[in-house]
Structures are given as C-alpha cells and as structure tokens.
C-alpha cells in the first residue's frame, strides 16, 4: 500500500490521543535505556510503511502484536485516514485469522514495540535534511 495520500495530521492526532498511551502500557516495566532504535524512516509515508510492517507482520520471536490494543487502533486509524487502505488489508486479515496465536509478551516483542515507538516519533517529527 502507498501511504502517500493518507491524512497524516489526523493519524498523528489519533496516535497522540490513544495509540501512544497503549504502546506505553505495553512497554510498562521496561527500562528506557533498554533498547536502541535500529529501524528508521525518512518521511511520513515511509514511516507508515515501516509501522505497518512491524505492527502487523509476524517476526521471528514475536508473532502476536496484531491483536494488541495499539495494533487494532493503528489499523482503525489507517483504515479511516488512508484512502483504499481497508481494501488492501482484507486478504491479509483473513490470513492472520487462520494463524492466530495466544498472546505472549516476549523480550523480542518488547524490542519490536520500542522500535515502533521510535518510528511513530519520526512520523510525528520527520527531521528532513536542511538544504
């Protein structure tokens, strides 16, 4: 999906009001020095691409994020504020239902959510190169 035509300001507002708080809840008890951000993004569409990938695509050691509250709210925000996003996700959602696993918060998931917080931070404040 190409995130270029999303309403970035509406997504940002949704992030600040709810999604960010759910991410903080998920990370509660984790030291702020624990994880270094290794995934980066260069502009808002790129940030949303990376956010979608880390939120909804199972990775080795962390298969369960898509069922978390922050993920469901992310999905809702993208569906509302990114034209045509919902349609592209129908097949992906059906495939996800088939491989639903029980929720387990692993250290790998905590690291992945820390990366997500970093991506959202850059989505909110992309530091574009100065001419």
């Amino acid at each position: 999906y190409d995130f270029t035509n999303c309403d970035f300001e509406k997504i940002k507002a949704a992030y600040l009001s709810t999604i960010s708080k759910d991410l903080i809840t998920y990370m509660s008890g984790t030291k702020s020095t624990e994880f270094n951000n290794t995934v980066s993004c260069s502009n808002r569409p790129h940030c949303l691409t990376e956010i979608q990938s880390l939120t909804f695509n199972p990775t080795a050691g962390c298969a369960s994020l898509a069922k978390e509250m922050f993920a469901m709210k992310t999905k809702a925000a993208l569906a509302i504020w990114c034209p045509g996003y919902s349609e592209t996700q129908i097949n992906a959602t059906q495939a996800m239902k088939k491989r639903r696993k029980r929720k387990v918060t692993t250290n790998k998931c905590l690291e992945q959510v820390s990366q997500l917080q970093g991506l959202w931070r850059r989505f909110n404040r992309p530091l574009l190169k100065q001419q």
Epitope: E9, K12, A13, Y15, L16, S17, S20, I24, S32, T33, E34, F35, N36, N37, S40, Q117, G118, W120, R121, R122, F123, N124, R125, L127, L128, K129, Q130
Partner: antibody, heavy 119, light 107 residues
Framework: QVQLQQSGAEVKKPGASVKVSCKAS????????IEWVRQAPGQGLEWIGV????????YYSEKFQGRVTLTADKSTSTAYMELSSLRSEDSAVYFC????????????WGQGTTLTVSS | DIQMTQSPSSLSASVGDRVTITCRAS??????LVWYQQKPGKAPQLLVY???NLADGVPSRFSGSGSGTQFSLTISSLQPEDFATYYC?????????FGTGTKLEIK
Amino acid sequence: QVQLQQSGAEVKKPGASVKVSCKASGYAFTNYLIEWVRQAPGQGLEWIGVINPESGDTYYSEKFQGRVTLTADKSTSTAYMELSSLRSEDSAVYFCAKESLTGSSYDYWGQGTTLTVSS
Amino acid sequence: DIQMTQSPSSLSASVGDRVTITCRASENIYSNLVWYQQKPGKAPQLLVYGARNLADGVPSRFSGSGSGTQFSLTISSLQPEDFATYYCQHFYETPLTFGTGTKLEIK
C-alpha cells in the same frame, strides 16, 4: 531518571566562539532528538536548532545558520552546541532539551548555561 | 517561518480564579501545539502537547484546546504555584517557534 547536565557559565569577548555541552543520562541517547533553545535576559524562548544524535543530521534556525554547529558524541551521550562570531546580543541562557517519547514536545530540559558576551 | 502570537502578554489574577491564555499561529498548524510553564531562573516545564493532551504529572486544572490557528490554555482554579510565565510552541514543522509568552502575576 532522565537528566540533561549542561556545562557551566561562560564569559566571552565579541568575535570569539563558545562550545556548550549537554550530557544525557537515564535514556537511550541515540533514540531521541536534542534541541537547543536560548533565552536572553528578560526575553522569551528562541529556537536555535536540532540534532539527531544517531545520524548526526541537523537543522538550524535561519537566524543562526552559518554561526552555529550542533554535534553529538554517541560514546559519551553528550550533545554540543558551538556558536561562533559572538556578539553582545548572544548573551543569554542556552538550554538543551530532549524530545518526548511521542516526538511531539520536549519533556526534559537541561538546567541552562549562561553565556555573557562582553568586551 | 510560522509566527506564534500570545495574548495577553501579562495577566493579573487571584488564587481560585479561572484564567485563559490564547495563542495564534500565522498559518494552520492543525493540533501541533505545546504549552510550557516557566518559573524565574528555571527551565520550562511541559504542560500540554498535541494541543489538548496533558503531560504526565500535570494537575487536571490545566487544559488545552484549539486547532488550526487558534489555541488556548485554561487554568480552572489558580493555585499559588501557577504564577509563572507560559509559552506556546508550534510542533508542526522545522523550524519550531515559540509564542511571545504570557506572564501570570498575583493581583
């Protein structure tokens, strides 16, 4: 806990340069932007610029472009602001600040470094 | 650059009063506005981000509102520790700029 410890007060002559340090602790230094802001005596807050400590990318206010250099040393978790060609109107308190978890504000500030420029 | 204008520049009020400070942006900044409180000789402290979200540890008597170009910070019942200078700042795009400040004094 998160702390930004700035270097001590400086007195400089017009035309000289100054380098102010801001040592970060209590968080992953490279994950958050560091901003620099100044405040002249009895005046408001003025944004100077920002650095991404991970990449070294910077963005400066047009007013300071060419006179200010922001750097970061990842090994010591320290950010630096160097201001050259000093003039009397640069006399101010200089603050470093860390961007918040959400990237939508500054949540922690240094205690400030007082710069006096006088002949 | 986006200009931020605060009003009033100073304000006298009493403990228990309800006060509102306004901030106007020279162009649409959506909800990308922050409010800080600063006391003499100290660094500013974050009160509100995203125009209406209260920062951790900030008393509920503070509230922010507005979007686009018009914003306000309201203190519902002034406490002695609230007498300070308040600044708005846009967080829309680099370069960031601050408002001109509002000094809140005891009447």
